[in-house]
């Protein structure tokens, strides 16, 4: 706690300017009026204050706004935002996308901090859903943002927002998240023609069910192996050799290099060896000719 000392004669700040850089911490506390600071917050970011000086300025704002800062101040916090705790941020009511952008800009290039996560959470909850403009903004600053949300949180993403999602935004998503996002993407892109549809839906296919993969196999899409390897194993297993061949097109040759990895390994185990042989890739591990295939999952369901 900075001691309450009187401001020395002639040092009372009339405006927030660079002369304050040379004030000691106690002089800043004594000579800078909190209301003046609040109205000239946009200047603070342009002045190279030390971290210790920023602590004093934050303290003054905290005293002026014990219930939380108004948005007019929040928008111009600049580097002072880095001094805020998640507890401070929970008191805010941030409604403007411009305010959100201004604060994300301060943290640009760094990992998502607890402060930023709290800010985003407050903002999204205030809006009620992750609209397209918000998603656009968040994924521009944090490409992995979408994959940091729980399936429950993702359920609030409207299909229209899916247009803002780029392939790299989904790189770290797990199957549970893609399960939620895929139906939204399917709905968002439903009016596109075959090839255009596939380009857009490709990143989301980790959440696609078997029937959708079967439908895609009829459209000459030529899925690459990287996409195929991200498909749900349970969605791939029921596909026939002919369907996988159609789905992958010229990329089918890549199966050989992936034969020991899921889902290819598990899919091979479910195929007849003579069907696999028709691919001419030397894939081994299929069901030998003459063996009966029992669907154990069906048998368990019946018993």
């Amino acid at each position: 706690e900075v001691e309450k000392t009187a401001c020395p004669s002639g040092k009372k700040a009339r405006e927030i300017d660079e002369s304050l850089i040379f004030y000691k911490k106690w002089e800043l506390e004594a000579c800078v009026d909190a209301a003046l600071l609040a109205t000239q917050m946009d200047r603070v970011n342009a002045i190279p204050f030390t971290y210790e000086q920023l602590d004093v300025l934050k303290h003054k704002l905290d005293e002026l706004y014990p219930q939380g800062y108004p948005e007019s101040v929040i928008q111009h916090l600049g580097y002072l935002f880095l001094k805020m705790s998640p507890e401070d941020i929970r008191k805010w009511n941030v409604t403007s996308l411009e305010t959100l952008k201004a604060l994300l800009e301060v943290n640009k290039g760094h990992e998502m901090s607890p402060q930023v996560a709290t800010l985003i959470d407050r903002f999204v909850k205030g809006r009620g859903q992750l609209d397209k403009d918000t998603l656009d903004t968040l994924t521009a600053f944090y490409p992995g943002y979408l994959c940091s949300l729980s399936p429950e949180e993702l359920s609030s993403v409207p299909p229209s927002s899916i247009w803002a999602v780029r392939p790299q935004d989904l790189d770290t998503c797990d199957p549970r998240q893609l399960d939620v996002l895929y139906p939204k993407a399917r709905l968002a892109f439903q009016n596109m023609n075959g090839s255009e549809y596939f380009v857009k839906i490709q990143s989301f296919l980790g959440g696609a069910p078997t029937e959708d993969l079967k439908a895609l196999s009829q459209q000459n899409v030529s899925m690459d192996l990287a996409t195929f390897m991200k498909l749900r194993t349970d969605a791939v297993l029921p596909l026939t050799v002919a369907e996988v061949q159609k789905l992958l097109g010229p990329h089918v040759e890549g199966l050989k290099a992936e034969e020991r990895h899921r889902p290819v390994r598990d899919w091979i185990l479910r195929q007849r060896q003579d069907d696999l042989d028709t691919l001419g890739l030397g894939l081994q591990g299929g069901i030998p000719n003459g063996y009966l295939v029992l669907d154990l999952s069906m048998q368990e369901a019946l018993s």
Partner: antibody, heavy 116, light 110 residues
Framework: EVQLLESGGGLVQPGGSLRLSCAAS????????MSWVRQAPGKGLEWVSG????????YYADSVRGRFTVSRDNSKNTLYLQMNSLRAEDTAVYYC?????????WGQGTLVTVSS | QSVLTQPPSASGTPGQRVTISCTGS????????VSWYQQLPGTAPKLLIY???KRPSGVPDRFSGSKSGTSASLAISGLRSEDEADYYC???????????FGGGTKVTVL
Amino acid sequence: EVQLLESGGGLVQPGGSLRLSCAASGFTFSNYAMSWVRQAPGKGLEWVSGIPPDSGSKYYADSVRGRFTVSRDNSKNTLYLQMNSLRAEDTAVYYCAKNMFSFDYWGQGTLVTVSS
Amino acid sequence: QSVLTQPPSASGTPGQRVTISCTGSSSNIGSNAVSWYQQLPGTAPKLLIYYNSKRPSGVPDRFSGSKSGTSASLAISGLRSEDEADYYCGSWDPSLNGYVFGGGTKVTVL
């Protein structure tokens, strides 16, 4: 009204010395950092030196470091620039300016000519 | 060779908009505020823009400044004959422990 008035310029031989002064008025001189900026004939602006209110740290451009010394007397509201070992390339109009990170007021300048 | 890079000249007819760029690096413009100075022929420089985009009192709102990343720009809208001058950008550079200027841009009103 803020006023800055430089003096002390003139003709000097290479290797010689000069001391420039800048008398300030219209603001609380002791609260503000001050700077010197120069401009060679027909050329652009070049920052020379800066000094904080308490003279604690002093800042210099590489081109003058070790030859020029900035100082101030807050009781006289005056800024100084002691220039030693002068070279032909130091020929310029020398301006004093208020502040160190953004110069909001400038003097009219004093001409320093270094020539034999 | 100036640390900040400006175009040597710019021109326009009366009423036009002229923009001057100023390019620096992460150690100057990228981390500190930019100022713009106007120097009319035969006079001392005058502060035109400070803290990236603020105008001192008395500077017409025809002059505006902005900064993005490691670059800044000065725009003069509704160009007038009295705007014919040299314009300099400047910023503090902590890596040099000093202030750096651009080489200056001569604005001509055609």
